[in-house]
């Protein structure tokens, strides 16, 4: 025979074809072997010109031999080489599908691989590719879009060889709150890590605001609006600065009175204050908290105390905000000026969390009177808020 070729090569099959001998022959003897694969020999009829090779090993170079037989006579042997395809991974499945995450799992191919190419594509045409290592059989997809159909495909790699792709289709869960109006809604969407998030005032996507969410304290879902921790930020700022907000939301900052007014106008909110000093901790929670608008000079409402820090905010209830350049307190002197801070001063304060960091002079420092008095500046303080009915919302989500 002559012209031995292989066609239709897959990971486990190939078709051998040849030109027949000129003379009439009784049979053809076909043998094939690969590295680490024992030789297989088959005899076929002399009028056959092709033979299907099956049960081949994937990603293996085979040597194929064929000769003709007529009676006791044997023709010379002709040889061809071919390499089987890399077999595909199997059983690609998407599990633990959430609004923005999913877990892909698969079974490895029989052949050894140098890695996998994962491709996932949303219906809007957004395509992402990632290469993972050879020992990996699962991969967590993140930053997916909620309520979106995805096609995930996987292909095994072995050097230059690539398997066929297999695919699975899944749909992410719709967000409970596509435009969360506070950190509690972000949390109910499944975000449970403290850090920076975008919220949307009144759920309006045009009213985006970056906030720091505390997702751990007492069940989480808190918008942090004040943090003192190291004294790097200057809190002796004017009215305009306190209205707008200032600082780094990962470090020391004030979120801004305008933002507090807009957030607390969305519904009934509670206030939590966390204090830490030399290993001691204390907290105060007020189940009613709101900040009025600029016309009221950001009037404070704070009621319904519980906690361990002592009810120091009660003294400030009903007061307007004061800064050194806008004195709205009830003192003859300017409290903000006297105590180098800003707050809902009265005459003057039980709480001075925007006071001078580290200043232990009477009433000048970061004070919470009913915890550490006025002659001790507290090392760490955070003020934060979340909806008063958060516990009910959380319970509803868990049942769902």
């Amino acid at each position: 025979p002559s012209g031995l070729v292989t066609a239709n090569i897959t990971d486990s099959e190939a078709l051998a074809r040849w030109q027949p001998a000129i003379a009439t022959v009784d049979s053809y003897v076909i043998s094939y072997t690969g590295e680490k694969v024992p030789e297989i020999t088959r005899t076929v009829s002399g009028n056959t010109v092709e033979y299907a090779l099956t049960d081949l090993e994937p990603a293996t170079e085979y040597t194929l031999r064929i000769f003709a037989e007529k009676g006791p006579q044997k023709s010379s042997t002709i040889t061809a080489k071919f390499t089987t395809d890399l077999d595909s991974p199997r059983d690609l499945t998407a599990t633990e599908v959430q609004s923005e995450t999913a877990l892909l799992t698969w079974r490895p191919p029989r052949a050894s691989v140098t890695g996998y190419l994962l491709v996932y594509e949303s219906v809007d045409g957004t395509v992402k590719e990632v290469i993972v290592g050879p020992d990996t059989t699962s991969y967590s997809l993140a930053d997916l879009s909620p309520s979106t159909h995805y096609t995930a495909k996987i292909q095994a790699l072995n050097g230059p060889l690539r398997s066929n792709m297999i695919q699975t289709i899944f749909t992410t869960i719709g967000l409970l709150y596509p435009f969360p109006k506070d950190c509690s809604q972000a949390m109910l969407n499944g975000d449970t890590t403290s850090g920076l998030y975008t919220i949307y005032l009144n759920g309006d996507k045009a009213e985006a605001l970056e906030v720091f969410c505390d997702m751990t304290s007492d069940g989480g879902g808190w918008i942090v609006f004040l943090r003192r921790k190291n004294g790097r930020e200057n809190f002796y700022q004017n009215w305009k600065a306190y209205a707008a907000g200032f600082g780094d939301r990962r470090e020391e900052f004030w979120l801004g009175l305008d933002n507090l007014n807009k957030i607390t106008a969305q519904g009934q909110y509670e206030l939590r204050v966390d204090l830490r000093d030399h290993g001691e901790t204390a907290f105060a929670v007020y189940d009613k908290f709101s900040v009025g608008d600029a016309k009221t000079r950001y009037k404070l409402k704070v009621e319904g105390y519980s906690g361990t820090a002592g009810d120091s905010m009660a003294y400030h209830n009903g007061r307007s905000f004061s800064t050194f350049d806008k004195d709205t307190d009830s003192a003859i002197t300017n409290c903000a000026l006297s105590y180098k801070g800003a707050f809902w001063y009265r005459n003057c304060h039980r709480v001075n969390l925007m006071g001078r960091y580290g200043d232990n002079n009477h009433s000048q420092g970061v004070n919470w009177f009913h915890w550490k008095g006025h002659e001790h500046s507290i090392q760490f303080a955070e003020m934060k808020l979340r909806p008063s009915n958060f516990r009910n919302l959380e319970g509803r989500r868990k049942r769902a």
Partner: antibody, heavy 120, light 107 residues
Framework: QVQLVESGGGLVQPGRSLRLSCAAS????????MHWVRQAPGKGLEWVSG????????YYADSVKGRFTISRDNAKNSLYLQMNSLRAEDTALYYC?????????????WGQGTMVTVSS | DIQMTQSPASLPTPVGDRVTITCRAS??????LNWYQQKPGKAPKLLIY???NLETGVPSRFSGSGSGTDFTLTISSLQPEDFATYYC?????????FGQGTKVDIK
């Protein structure tokens, strides 16, 4: 109008007990801290005890700590002072006083007082 | 406890005169100071809270000032109905303490 009316005073022997009451009207009682302040005959004012709006927190002057107990019944708009182990120096006119909104340590409404005389 | 010291103890004053009563705290109390008026046989009445704020219904001839440890109650022009005993009270810390009183009587 806002009103506080004390009752329960009288003559009592040293070591005995007495319970003072204060009936409040004209305001949302459980929104406010309430206090007892006393005035010995011909003397100045002395704060005795205070209680938060919910009744969850109570405070006492050192001179009465361990002997007097302040309490309130918000359903009845009433404030009480249970006085045990009475001494001659507890003789005074006892005023019930309403705290202002907020901390409640400023007394904006006072009753007319009830006289307690401790004498053998 | 915070001691409150009032002076003078007694202040004979003619009608129409200006009256000044001082009150000193034994420690710094910001503006946590109140003034009360008590007439014979009557309960005390709140006049000034937070050192300088006039209680509703109190005539404007009464005023308060001061911060920290030193405070003053002023009656700009003494009227016959103002003859009474005046007490300062600190609301800075428990126990809330009163001054010993200043008796303003007719000269």
């Amino acid at each position: 109008q806002v009103q506080l009316v004390e009752s329960g005073g009288g003559l009592v022997q040293p070591g005995r007990s007495l319970r003072l009451s204060c009936a409040a009207s004209g305001f949302t009682f459980d929104d406010y801290a309430m206090h007892w302040v006393r005035q010995a005959p011909g003397k100045g004012l002395e704060w005795v005890s205070g209680i938060s709006g919910s009744g969850g927190s109570t405070y006492y002057a050192d001179s009465v700590k361990g002997r007097f107990t302040i309490s309130r019944d918000n359903a009845k708009n009433s404030l009480y002072l249970q006085m045990n182990s009475l001494r001659a120096e507890d003789t005074a006119l006892y005023y019930c006083a309403k705290g202002t909104r907020g901390e409640g340590d400023t007394f904006d409404i006072w009753g007319q007082g009830t006289m307690v005389t401790v004498s053998s | 406890d915070i001691q409150m010291t009032q002076s003078p103890a007694s202040l004979p004053t003619p009608v129409g005169d200006r009256v000044t009563i001082t009150c000193r705290a034994s420690q710094y109390i910001q503006g946590f100071l109140n003034w009360y008026q008590q007439k014979p046989g009557k309960a005390p009445k709140l006049l000034i809270y937070d050192a300088s704020n006039l209680e509703t219904g109190v005539p404007s001839r009464f005023s308060g000032s001061g911060s920290g440890t030193d405070f003053t109650l002023t009656i700009s022009s003494l009227q016959p109905e103002d003859f009474a005993t005046y007490y300062c009270q600190q609301s800075y810390s428990t126990p809330q303490t009163f001054g010993q009183g200043t008796k303003v009587d007719i000269k």
